[in-house]
Every structure is written in structure tokens, then in C-alpha cells.
């Protein structure tokens, strides 16, 4: 019969023969032959291969370096890499999460629209009319101005995006 030019899924072509790939978590030791199957070896403790493969070396698990603010979010297995995330108050600088930076704080006049996570930074928004923020914070949203009316008070000083209104007593009508 004609030697194959293409192989099925989870196979590879070598020496005009289709050999089984090694399953995830194992690496190649010997290719198959007409009489023998592919020989594979399991990856070691800190290694992985996440696909059907013909690799002769397993990959090292990612190291979550605490000096870079990283910690393990999910421990690696023989078939998956370790997933790193950042310590509390920090977030990843890239999708690969190779290092961390401190969460950004929203300045006075801005409030937190979305609190930061291990993988995304704080999202700030300007406080709209009727709201203010007088602190620099990674958690605080814009607060609504105090309603003087509900306290039977009047506005003595208008609010801004950074300051609350100042309420005061209503002027008494003189008799």
C-alpha cells in the first residue's frame, strides 16, 4: 500500500508512517514503527504538556514570583500550566501575568466605576453633577450630594465634583 501523506487527528507522520501523538502530560521517548507503538514518558512534578504532542521535553510550570507581587491562583498539573495572579491591591501588567502593579486610585472628583481585580486595573469615572468624591481611593464610588431639603435645611454652599454641598438653617421670616 501507498505510504500515507497525512494522518488522523492525534497522530503524526514520521518515516512514512502515522504514529500516535503522546497524550497531554506525557512526552515522546520513541516514535512508533511498523511493529511498535509510540513510547511516551509522563512529565515530572513541576512540568507539563497541555496538548497531544511529539515533544521530547516537557515545559516547566510558570513560577509565580512573590518578589514581583505574584501568587499562585491555580496550581499546575502534568497537563496544565500554573496560573498566577497578583497579591491583594495589585493587578497583572499583561494577559500572561508576568508581573504586577499597584491598583490605581481615583483622584478627588473621580469615583470608582469598576473595582480592580487580580487581572484588571481600577476604572475611574468623573463624578457627574449631583455627585462628588473628596478622597483618592481605589474603592470609593462618587457619593451623591447631601439633600438639604430632606433635612429641612437649605444649600448654603453649592457642591462640586470634589465637595459636598454645605447645608444651613433656613432664614426665619421676620414678623
Amino acid at each position: 500500500p501507498e505510504p500515507p501523506t497525512a494522518c488522523r487527528e492525534k497522530q503524526y507522520l514520521i518515516n512514512s508512517q502515522c504514529c500516535s501523538l503522546c497524550q497531554p502530560g506525557q512526552k515522546l521517548v520513541s516514535d512508533c514503527t511498523e511493529f511498535t507503538e509510540t513510547e511516551c514518558l509522563p512529565c515530572g512534578e513541576s512540568e507539563f504538556l497541555d496538548t497531544w504532542n511529539r515533544e521530547t521535553h516537557c515545559h516547566q510550570h510558570k513560577y509565580c514570583d512573590p518578589n514581583l507581587g505574584l501568587r499562585v491562583q491555580q496550581k499546575g498539573t502534568s497537563e496544565t500550566d500554573t496560573i498566577c495572579t497578583c497579591e491583594e491591591g495589585w493587578h497583572c501588567t499583561s494577559e500572561a501575568c508576568e508581573s504586577c502593579v499597584l491598583h490605581r486610585s481615583c483622584s478627588p472628583g473621580f469615583g470608582v466605576k469598576q473595582i480592580a481585580t487580580g487581572v484588571s486595573d481600577t476604572i475611574c469615572e468623573p463624578c457627574p453633577v449631583g455627585f462628588f468624591s473628596n478622597v483618592s481611593s481605589a474603592f470609593e464610588k462618587c457619593h451623591p450630594w447631601t439633600s438639604c431639603e430632606t433635612k429641612d435645611l437649605v444649600v448654603q454652599q453649592a457642591g462640586t465634583n470634589k465637595t459636598d454641598v454645605v447645608c444651613g438653617p433656613q432664614d426665619r421670616l421676620r414678623a
Partner: antibody
């Protein structure tokens, strides 16, 4: 008939190195990886590592890194285990073993007894 | 590494007696990667059972194996004199490959 023929017993002094051989016959040598196993009274059977006879890539048990070096000579269908800086702890029987893809170590060498003594 | 703990370490049995040797793994392993070897004094280990329950070529039917996860066992349904040997379990699930410390089976 598949055979793994190992070199003879060795009596060596501490601090030196020794190279044990394992000649495969009765099959295509490069079709199977060659594993090495240590057997001592203290630790029973310990896997040292494996060498891909076709690619020449060796994988070691971390415990034996720096102690053992695996190599092959395809032309003579022979695998080698070299042990460095020998101490009495290295006194043991060393086996080469061939693993079939469907089952584990199906053929073993007869073993090489290594005695390290001053 | 995966530690395989065999028990008992040593035992003696009379001909005809049923024998069970256990092998406990420190973490779960696939049953496809647990094997048993028999070794007699002065000889190399010999493959006895592969992939938990498959008898190697030429192994008598009185031998059987079972188990899953972290717990495996080897059974001899009726002990014979030639079965006196040391038995080792072995895992090929994770590198480094490891063996149990062995169970020495003696004839009473």
C-alpha cells in the same frame, strides 16, 4: 529473542567513576527507550532515568542528577550508565530495562553489581 | 513524587492459601499506569501484571490484580511453592517513576 546484556561486576574505590554498558539484541535498538534502575538493600528499586535511543535525549530522576549520566551508541546498539564520584551509597545492582509502549519494563538486563570499597 | 506503600512488608503462606498484597499511592494514579513485578533471589525483576489487572505473557491465572485511584492489590488465589518471591508495585503515572518497597512472600 530480545536480550539486554550488561557488563560485568565492578569493584571500585570511592571517588572514582564507573561506566556500565547494556547491549540490546533481538530487536531494533532505536525503537525503544532504555531505562536504568538501581536496586539496593536500603532503598529497594529506584528509577534512575531513561534515554531515548533514537533522539539521544535523557530524562533523569532529580535524585540522580549529577550522579548519573546516560548515553547511547546506536552503531553498537549499546546504552551506558556512568556514575560519578562514587561512595558506598552507590553500591547496588544496576539494571537496564526496555519498556514496551503497551506494557512497562518487559525486558531487563541481568544486572551489574557495583561495589564501592576502599 | 508519588510514594507507593506496600503491605505487608513480609509474609509467609502455606500452599493453597489465598494471598493479598496491597499497594497504596500517595496521590491518585490512573489504573493504566500501575504494574506489578515479581523478583526471585539472584534474578532480575519480571513483569507480572500490567495496567492493574492484565497478566503478562506466561503468568499463571492464579494471579490477579485490581484497584483504582490510590488503592491497588495483587492476589494469588492459591499459593504455590514457586510463588515464593518479592513482589513490587510500580507507577508510570508521573515522573520520577517509582516502585513500592516490596513484599517478601515466603513459603510456610
Amino acid at each position: 529473542e530480545v536480550q539486554l546484556q550488561q557488563s560485568g561486576a565492578e569493584l571500585v574505590s570511592p571517588g572514582v567513576s564507573v561506566k556500565i554498558s547494556c547491549k540490546g539484541s533481538g530487536y531494533t535498538f532505536t525503537d525503544h527507550g532504555m531505562h536504568w534502575v538501581k536496586q539496593s538493600h536500603a532503598k529497594s528499586l529506584e528509577w534512575i532515568g531513561v534515554i531515548s535511543t533514537s533522539y539521544g535525549v535523557a530524562t533523569y530522576n532529580q535524585k540522580f542528577k549529577g550522579k548519573a549520566t546516560l548515553s547511547v551508541d546506536k552503531s553498537s546498539s549499546t546504552a551506558y550508565l556512568e556514575l560519578a564520584r562514587l561512595t558506598s551509597e552507590d553500591s547496588a545492582i544496576y539494571y537496564c530495562a526496555r519498556r514496551d509502549s503497551k506494557s512497562p519494563f518487559d525486558y531487563w538486563g541481568q544486572g551489574t553489581t557495583l561495589t564501592v570499597s576502599s | 513524587q508519588i510514594v507507593l506503600t506496600q503491605s505487608p512488608a513480609i509474609m509467609s503462606a502455606s500452599p493453597g492459601e489465598k494471598i493479598t498484597i496491597t499497594c497504596s499511592a500517595s496521590s491518585s494514579i490512573s489504573s493504566n499506569y500501575l504494574h506489578w513485578y515479581q523478583q526471585k533471589p539472584g534474578f532480575s525483576p519480571k513483569l507480572l501484571i500490567y495496567r492493574t489487572s492484565n497478566l503478562a505473557s506466561g503468568v499463571p491465572a492464579r494471579f490477579s490484580g485490581s484497584g483504582s485511584g490510590t488503592s491497588y492489590s495483587l492476589t494469588i488465589s492459591s499459593m504455590e511453592a514457586e510463588d515464593a518471591a518479592t513482589y513490587y508495585c510500580h507507577q508510570y503515572h508521573r515522573s520520577p517513576l517509582t516502585f513500592g518497597a516490596g513484599t517478601k512472600l515466603e513459603l510456610k
